[in-house]
Structure formats: structure tokens, C-alpha cells
Interface confidence: low
């Protein structure tokens, strides 16, 4: 792949990551969300083949809007298939900085042992894996994907009381659903899905993440 194409891909991936962080409630400046390809080149370089940028230079650290001490890393490993050694380096970094959540943007995937280590480290350290291919577009901006809103505990309690339901009576959505992964929705949370409706203006459904 030539430098121009790779620079474009890195810009698109980083842009989606910034939108994802913003949509999860982390503080991302408007100029980061709006960053043009030219601005990306000015900030990072346009010669990935010569290490400008290296993928590790795209590392992101964001703080949550509600609690600035709640921070999240986004790592961009150099190696195409990420091994357990890299995961250990990231965990050490997280430990040093007292950060418990991170996203890892991988080029081709992870080794089975690296994947298993993510499971083993939860819930102390939450590391989520994204394939860079999935981040070339922002799935939530696709016209066929309805708006998803993660509900607070209070909102779920009110919803269940209003409809005289138990939580397990709600329809399900898989934790591995692409939109659920985008928002980082955990098992047991409830998501409100808002679709446009010709008759009712909008049609709302509720789903329990499993």
C-alpha cells in the first residue's frame, strides 16, 4: 500500500476513534472531531513507510466528561497480529497511569493467547479490540443503523416499572453486536433504539445486552 493510501486510512480510523470516544462521553475537542486529512498530515506526517507517523504515535488518551479521572487509552500496535507481549506492555502502562480501560486497534487480529489475556484481565482492566477495517467507516453514521442510546440504571428502573416488566422480559441484543461494541455497552445494560417511523414519527424499542 502506498503512503497516500495508508495516510488516508490512518486518518479515517483515527477520526472514527475520536467520534467513538466522544459518543462514549469522553472529552474530545471539536477540532479533533473535524480534523481534515491535511490537518492530520500536518500533525502526524504523510510518510508512514518512513515512520511518520508510526502507529504508536496515534495513541490517544481521553478523559470522561463526567469524571476527568476516568480515562481511556486507545492503542495502535505496530505488529499486524498482536501477541501477549504487547498486551502486557499496555497493561503495565495502564497500571503506571492508573487507567483501567483501553481500546486496541489491530491491523489483522490477535493471537489466541492475547485474546485470552483480555478475558483474564477483566474486570480489573477492560481492553477492547477493534479491527482497523471496522473503523474505516463509522457504523453509527450508516443510514440503516438507528440511533442507540445507553440507558442509565434509573431510566431502566423507571422503564420496567412503567411497563410492569422484569429485566429478563426485554428483547435481547448481543454484546458482540457492532453497535454495542462501538458504544462499549456491557452485558446487563439496556439500550434504547430509536427508529424513524412513518406513522408515529419515531418508534422506540428497548434491548437488554447479553
Amino acid at each position: 500500500m502506498d503512503d497516500e493510501e495508508e495516510t488516508y486510512r490512518l486518518w479515517k480510523i483515527r477520526k472514527t476513534i475520536m467520534q467513538l470516544c466522544h459518543d462514549r462521553g469522553y472529552l474530545v475537542t471539536q477540532d479533533e472531531l473535524d480534523q481534515t486529512l491535511e490537518e492530520f498530515k500536518a500533525q502526524f506526517g504523510d510518510k508512514p513507510s518512513e515512520g511518520r507517523p508510526r502507529r504508536t504515535d496515534l495513541t490517544v488518551l481521553v478523559a470522561h466528561n463526567d469524571d476527568p479521572t476516568d480515562q481511556m487509552f486507545v492503542f495502535f500496535p505496530e505488529e499486524p497480529k498482536v501477541g501477549i507481549k504487547t498486551i502486557k506492555v499496555y497493561c503495565q502502562r495502564m497500571q503506571e497511569e492508573n487507567i483501567t480501560r483501553a481500546l486496541i486497534v489491530v491491523q489483522q487480529g490477535m493471537t489466541p493467547s492475547a485474546k485470552q489475556s483480555l478475558v483474564d484481565m477483566a474486570p480489573k482492566y477492560i481492553l477492547e479490540q477493534f479491527l482497523q477495517q471496522e473503523l474505516l467507516i463509522n457504523i453509527t453514521e450508516h443510514e440503516l443503523v438507528p440511533e442507540h442510546v445507553v440507558m442509565t440504571k434509573e431510566e431502566v428502573t423507571e422503564l420496567l416499572a412503567r411497563y410492569k416488566l422484569r429485566e429478563n422480559q426485554l428483547p435481547r441484543i448481543q454484546a458482540g453486536d457492532p453497535v454495542a461494541r462501538y458504544f462499549g455497552i456491557k452485558r446487563g445494560q439496556v439500550v434504547k433504539i430509536i427508529r424513524p417511523s412513518e406513522t408515529a414519527g419515531r418508534y422506540i424499542t428497548y434491548r437488554l445486552v447479553q
Epitope: 500536518a42 506526517g45 511518520r52 507517523p53 504508536t56 488518551l61 497511569e97
Partner: antibody
């Protein structure tokens, strides 16, 4: 407490070489990009180079090909290797730390909140 | 490269005066600008970043404003320790550039 301590300055002849070091303490060095900035006598501040947390380097046009910016995270040390020195390179050289980690990346930009006291380099025959 | 132009290059003022410095960028740098204070024999000190954010520990008499290409540093009531040279710096992209100083 954050500290940056430069060393290695001195008198060098035109065309000669010199290596400056900057030892950092009081913060997680590996998480931060680092920069060298200089001030020539009676002049303003001039940015020289930047080494990202992932080792990516950026240089000012005036030093490209002559200066090399590098880092050793295991020793919390930033280096500036200068060769082909000219009279115009005579200056006080500062190492500087950005106020946010992963600067030059992520949501942050390069604003330098901590500076060393500077190392004086004199290029003269 | 982005050129940064400061004005005035120097000014005379007295303790208690309100003082303003301006900095102009050769292209739109949004709010990616910092102001530093430099005194002889001392290391530069960050005063303002992101055009208007006051660095921790910097007195509130210092303030910054502007975005795009035009920026201002203001000192509301000049103190004896404020007599120094002030530099603006763009952080929009590489190469990083400073103004010539005021």
C-alpha cells in the same frame, strides 16, 4: 516534582559534533513526546525537533540532516546529536515536556509546561 | 510552514497598567496557540495554552483570547515581576513555530 536536566553543552569548532542529553524525572517519560528548543543570543525561541512517544521524529528545516533527536525510555533520557555545527547554531538549548501525554497524537497539542535550565552550545574557532 | 507574527515588538508600561500583546498566524490554527514568558537566565514559562486556558499556577491577571489567525495575551494589572519577553507558539502542526517575541 517534574525535573529536566540538560548536559553536554560546551565550545565546539565549526563542522564539529556534540551530543546533548536531557534526563527527565517526576513523570512517566515514555508516555510523553519531547522536544528541543533553542535560543540564540539576543534572538527568540526556535523549535528544533520533537520525538513522539512512539519514536516518530519531526525536525525544523534548518537542522534536518545535521541533527538527530532520539530517546532512551529505559533511562528517561532525551538526546540531541548535533553534527556539521555552524556559528548560527550557537545558542542555549532547552529540552521541553508537553503538558499532555501522547502529544502530537490523540486529542492533544504541543504546549510545553516544563523546560530544563538549558545547555549552552558555542560554535567558534 | 505557519508563520507567527507578534506585535508590538516592545512596549513601555508601568506597574498597574493593562497590557495587551497580539499574535497573528499566517493560516487558520483554530485555537492551537500558547503564550510563554521568558526572563533572562531563566527557562521559558507556559502561561496560556489552547489560546485561552490558564496554565496551573499562573496568576489570573494573565488571560488569552482569539481563534483562527488572531490572538491576544492580556495582563490586567502589570506587576513588577511581569516585565519580561512574551512569545506565542502555534501547536497546530509540525514544524512548531514561535513568534519573534514582544
Amino acid at each position: 516534582e517534574v525535573q529536566l536536566l540538560e548536559s553536554g553543552g560546551g565550545l565546539v569548532q565549526p563542522g564539529g559534533s556534540l551530543r546533548l542529553s536531557c534526563v527527565a524525572s517526576g513523570f512517566t517519560f515514555a508516555s510523553y513526546g519531547m522536544a528541543w528548543v533553542r535560543q540564540a543570543p539576543g534572538q527568540g525561541l526556535t523549535w528544533i525537533c520533537f520525538v513522539g512517544s512512539g519514536d516518530t521524529t519531526h525536525y525544523a528545516e534548518s537542522v534536518k540532516g545535521r541533527f538527530t533527536c532520539s530517546r532512551d525510555n529505559s533511562n528517561n533520557t532525551l538526546y540531541l546529536h548535533m553534527s556539521g555545527l555552524r556559528g548560527a547554531d550557537t545558542a542555549k538549548y532547552y529540552c521541553a515536556k508537553p503538558n499532555s501525554p501522547f502529544t502530537g497524537s490523540g486529542s492533544f497539542h504541543n504546549y510545553f509546561d516544563y523546560w530544563g535550565q538549558g545547555a549552552l552550545v558555542i560554535v567558534s574557532s | 510552514d505557519i508563520q507567527m507574527t507578534q506585535s508590538p515588538s516592545s512596549l513601555s508600561a508601568s506597574v498597574g497598567d493593562r497590557v495587551t500583546f497580539t499574535c497573528r498566524a499566517s493560516q487558520n490554527i483554530r485555537n492551537n496557540l500558547a503564550w510563554y514568558q521568558l526572563k533572562p537566565g531563566k527557562a521559558p514559562q507556559l502561561l496560556i495554552y489552547s489560546a485561552s486556558s490558564l496554565e496551573t499556577g499562573v496568576p489570573s491577571r494573565f488571560s488569552g483570547s482569539g481563534s483562527g489567525t488572531d490572538f491576544t495575551l492580556a495582563i490586567s494589572s502589570l506587576q513588577p515581576e511581569d516585565f519580561a519577553t512574551y512569545y506565542c507558539q502555534q501547536a497546530h502542526g509540525f514544524p512548531i513555530t514561535f513568534g519573534q517575541g514582544s
